[in-house]
């Protein structure tokens, strides 16, 4: 059962796993949620009745029954992890804590103009977990405006104390705000020879990389595959770090793979969700339960629904045995990974999908793309919406993209002459415009947020957000698309599609069925040559065929330029302006979404 509220002046008795320090009960709950075993916690707030050494302690707890006895205690705040909840979870914490000094290893000290600048520095520093900033009112003159970047083994402070005129906060890497590079490549036959901070067992290099990503100290990893010569090291995932943040030595070794933490791209690729099945593989660990199940998929479901289950092994039924049901072994361990991985025993293993809600919804795999043709099929572009105006009569106005459960990203130029959000309707999960009838459900628009630097599409800043009146329930036909990662600025996208109902302001010819066209990206330099009378800025991105032959009219204004990268779709552009459709096939010009990620997050995450 999901319990989100905090219990004031209440302490859970027993079940202690470990104690960490957090600046608030709210953050203690997040830490508990991300811990592999924590189900409950007790946080101690600052209070005259409490020993100051116990202030800000966050005791992480576990219980076989998923609950513990409650005891009254002043200043104690208790609660449950969000593991039991089905809603989306984020580790992003933008709070600034006034008069708190969060202790850790102070590895970098520099002058900063503000706490915000200090937080940005922390976010863009590969080692930084949190920071403390001495304000200009700080008593000691030589420490004023000093920004201390800190890290710890756990990613949380080793202690928190009260200190006047300082502020503290966390890195915003988990808010997708880091400018650090996102290196997704996995390097075969490579060992990174740097210090190991931890080691776990993993079935493949991808799982190893994901484990590295959500381990606070891991910057890169080396994985020894099941063919690794040294038997005791097979399936071993070594989590590594170095002072420089990069591997100091790369050794060529067959059957080893290495890669980097995906911290700077974690909002746009799955890092918690290990959804694959591993055939002829047994995961060892503490046994939680043994249940009969029809298939390995059913076994994974059982594991996902059992809150303490972390991974499983399914042994298929022997012929005609037990009504064709096999055995499903639900398992757990102290760190969420198998204690050992064995091959050749016929088992099928995998992980709980409960952790998938810690990943952005947009990373979920959608149904395979239909190759060829120009008409889309249902569910092919589940983030695509049709924005209608009801004034003077109802009609399709622009395309748009779902980027959050209350947010649509579109083009600013769509709202020329739109006086009020009341006349707008957003329809999602639509394939044919003819499906829209008077009784078709839609989302009302609460607010139109246009970039304040927008003047006209051709001058850039052609971006707008629509805040919906109600939230979108994600389904196969309506779900979000990932924003590109700032760390992905140098990625060369090769699988890009423009979609829409073919409507452009000047050519009022609208298609009934959602159209799609695969189009290559064009460099800004090349694009500038095609538009000599317009400035193609780095905040724009161009796409289209050099020699014509593709109908760029398929993209509506405001609709998406969607590019698939590493199996995840990213909203690379917003259809903005250009001379497609005419005989001369100039590239289409799109708003370059990666350049507006900060703006989008600032607007959508505002309290």
């Amino acid at each position: 059962e999901c319990v989100t509220q905090l219990l004031k002046d209440t302490c859970f008795e027993g079940g202690d796993i470990t104690t960490v320090f957090t600046p608030s009960a709210k953050y203690c709950q997040v830490v508990c949620t991300y811990h592999p075993r924590c189900l409950l916690f007790t946080f101690t707030a600052e209070s005259p009745s409490e020993d100051p050494t116990r202030w800000f302690t966050c005791v992480l707890k576990d219980s076989v029954t998923e609950t513990l006895p409650r005891v009254n205690r002043t200043a104690a705040i208790s609660g449950y992890s969000f593991k039991q909840c089905s809603h989306q979870i984020s580790a992003c914490n933008k709070d600034i804590y006034v008069d708190l000094d969060m202790k850790g290893i102070n590895y970098n000290s520099s002058v900063a103009k503000s706490a915000q600048e200090c937080q940005e520095r922390c976010t863009d520093d590969v080692h930084c977990h949190f920071f403390t900033y001495a304000t200009r009112q700080f008593p000691s003159l030589e420490h004023r405006n000093i920004c201390l970047l800190k890290h710890t083994q756990t990613g949380t402070p080793t202690r928190i104390t009260k200190l006047d005129k300082v502020v503290s906060g966390f890195s915003l890497k988990s808010c997708a705000l880091s400018n650090l590079a996102c290196i997704r490549d996995i390097f075969p036959n490579t060992v990174f020879a740097d210090s190991n901070i931890d080691s776990v067992m993993a079935p493949d290099a991808f799982v190893c990389g994901r484990i590295c990503t959500h381990h606070p100290g891991c910057l890169f990893f080396t994985f020894f595959s099941q063919e690794w010569p040294k038997e005791s090291q097979r399936n071993l995932c070594l989590l590594k770090t170095s002072e420089s943040g990069l591997p100091s030595t790369r050794i060529k070794k067959s059957k080893a793979l290495s890669g980097f933490s995906l911290q700077s791209c974690r909002h746009s690729i799955p890092v918690f969700c290990h959804s694959s099945f591993y055939h002829d593989t047994d995961f060892l660990g503490e046994e939680l339960d043994i249940v009969a199940a029809k298939s390995h998929e059913a076994c994974q479901k059982l594991c996902t629904n059992a809150v303490r289950c972390q991974f499983f092994t399914y042994t298929p039924a022997q012929a005609s045995c037990n009504e064709g049901k096999g055995k499903c072994y639900l398992k757990l361990s102290s760190n969420g990974s198998p204690t050992k991985i064995l091959h050749g025993r016929g088992g099928i293993s995998g992980y709980t999908l409960r952790l998938c809600k810690m990943d952005n919804e947009c990373t979920t795999k959608i149904k395979p793309r239909i190759v060829g043709g120009t008409a889309s099929v249902r569910g092919e572009w589940p983030w695509q919406v049709t924005l209608h105006t009801t004034s003077p009569t109802q009609r399709h106005l622009c395309g748009g993209s779902i980027i959050g459960n209350q947010w649509i990203l579109t083009a600013a130029h769509c709202f020329y002459g739109v006086e009020s959000p009341k006349i707008l309707r957003v329809y999602s999960g639509i394939l044919n415009q003819s499906e829209i009838k008077e009784d078709t459900s839609f989302f009302g628009v609460q607010e139109i947020i246009i970039h304040d630097q927008y003047k006209m599409a051709e001058s850039g800043y052609d971006i707008a957000l629509l805040k919906l009146e109600t939230t979108v329930n994600y389904t196969d036909s309506q779900r979000p698309i990932c924003l590109p990662s700032k760390g992905d600025r140098n990625v060369i996208y090769t699988d890009c599609w423009v979609t829409g109902w073919g409507y452009r302001k000047l050519r009022d010819k609208i298609q009934n069925t959602l159209q799609k066209a695969k189009i290559p990206l064009v460099t800004n330099e090349e694009c500038q040559k095609r538009y000599r009378g317009h400035k193609i800025t780095h905040k724009m991105i161009c796409a289209g065929y050099r020699e014509g032959g593709k109908d760029a009219c398929k993209g509506d204004s405001g609709g998406p330029l969607s590019c698939k990268h590493n199996e995840v779709w990213h909203l690379v552009g917003i259809t903005s302006w250009g001379e497609g459709c005419a005989q001369r096939e100039r590239p289409g010009v799109y708003t370059n979404v990666v350049e507006y990620v900060d703006w989008i997050l600032e607007k959508t995450q505002a309290v």
Epitope: E458, Q528, R532, G533, R546, E547, G578, E579, R584, E585
Partner: antibody
Framework: QVQLVQSGAEVKKPGASVKVSCKAS????????IEWVGQAPGQGLEWMGV????????NYNENFKDRVTMTRHTSISTAYMELSRLRSDDTAVYFC?????????????WGQGTLVTVSS | DIQMTQSPSSLSASVGDRVTITCKAS??????VAWYQQKPGKAPKLLIY???NRYTGVPSRFSGSGSGTDFTFTISSLQPEDIATYYC?????????FGQGTKLEIK
């Protein structure tokens, strides 16, 4: 009907500057690019640059980049081309022209041309 | 910059003749080719755009063809008023460039 009317002929000394105007009428001035093209006596046509009257954005040919300035005055639908540090080989007829499309294209309407003579 | 090489640089033909001028681009210019007519002391006039589209009011004896890098301008039956210099121009990539011109005279 669409018309581009240019200012009259000019005689200038080497080192001086000249500013040629081009007044547009009969269409929405901000919606089409204005190009400038030079033609030396007995020679071919050479593109000098373009101005977007809507945004004021300019793009110049490398050969003229450091000496040419294109501006516009939207309220009077007029574009200007100023060429500085004149040399005798700048003696030419300068044309303004409107592009056929909003984003560029062939030049469908031309001014009558302005002869600039550079002589000491 | 894309070079447009026009040939011949001059030609003499009789009234009623079929006249052909060619233009070769140094790289592909898609369909972004136009042809202009310029009479002495006058501004150029647009005749053909997008390789083969006749501009408004241009007589049907003027036509254009070609693709990629090779383009042809044709006057199917030369008239006395066609005496002028003809220019090709590419508009595919900035800076737009013109051919050096073909001066057409009547024999």
């Amino acid at each position: 009907q669409v018309q581009l009317v240019q200012s009259g002929a000019e005689v200038k000394k080497p080192g001086a500057s000249v500013k040629v105007s081009c007044k547009a009428s009969g269409y929405a001035f901000s919606n089409y690019l204005i190009e400038w093209v030079g033609q030396a006596p007995g020679q071919g046509l050479e593109w000098m640059g373009v101005i977007n009257p809507g945004s004021g954005y300019t793009n110049y040919n490398e050969n003229f980049k450091d000496r040419v300035t294109m501006t516009r005055h939207t309220s009077i639908s007029t574009a200007y081309m100023e060429l500085s540090r004149l040399r005798s080989d700048d003696t030419a007829v300068y044309f303004c022209a409107r592009t056929y499309g909003k984003y560029g294209g062939a030049m469908d309407f031309w001014g009558q041309g302005t002869l600039v003579t550079v002589s000491s | 910059d894309i070079q447009m090489t026009q040939s011949p640089s001059s030609l003499s033909a009789s009234v009623g003749d079929r006249v052909t001028i060619t233009c070769k681009a140094s790289q592909s210019v898609s369909n972004d080719v136009a042809w202009y007519q310029q009479k002495p002391g006058k501004a150029p006039k647009l005749l053909i755009y997008y390789i083969s589209n006749r501009y408004t009011g241009v007589p049907s004896r003027f036509s254009g063809s070609g693709s990629g890098t090779d383009f042809t301008f044709t006057i199917s039956s030369l008239q006395p008023e066609d005496i002028a210099t003809y220019y090709c121009q590419q508009d595919y990539s900035s800076p737009p460039t013109f051919g050096q011109g073909t001066k057409l005279e009547i024999k």
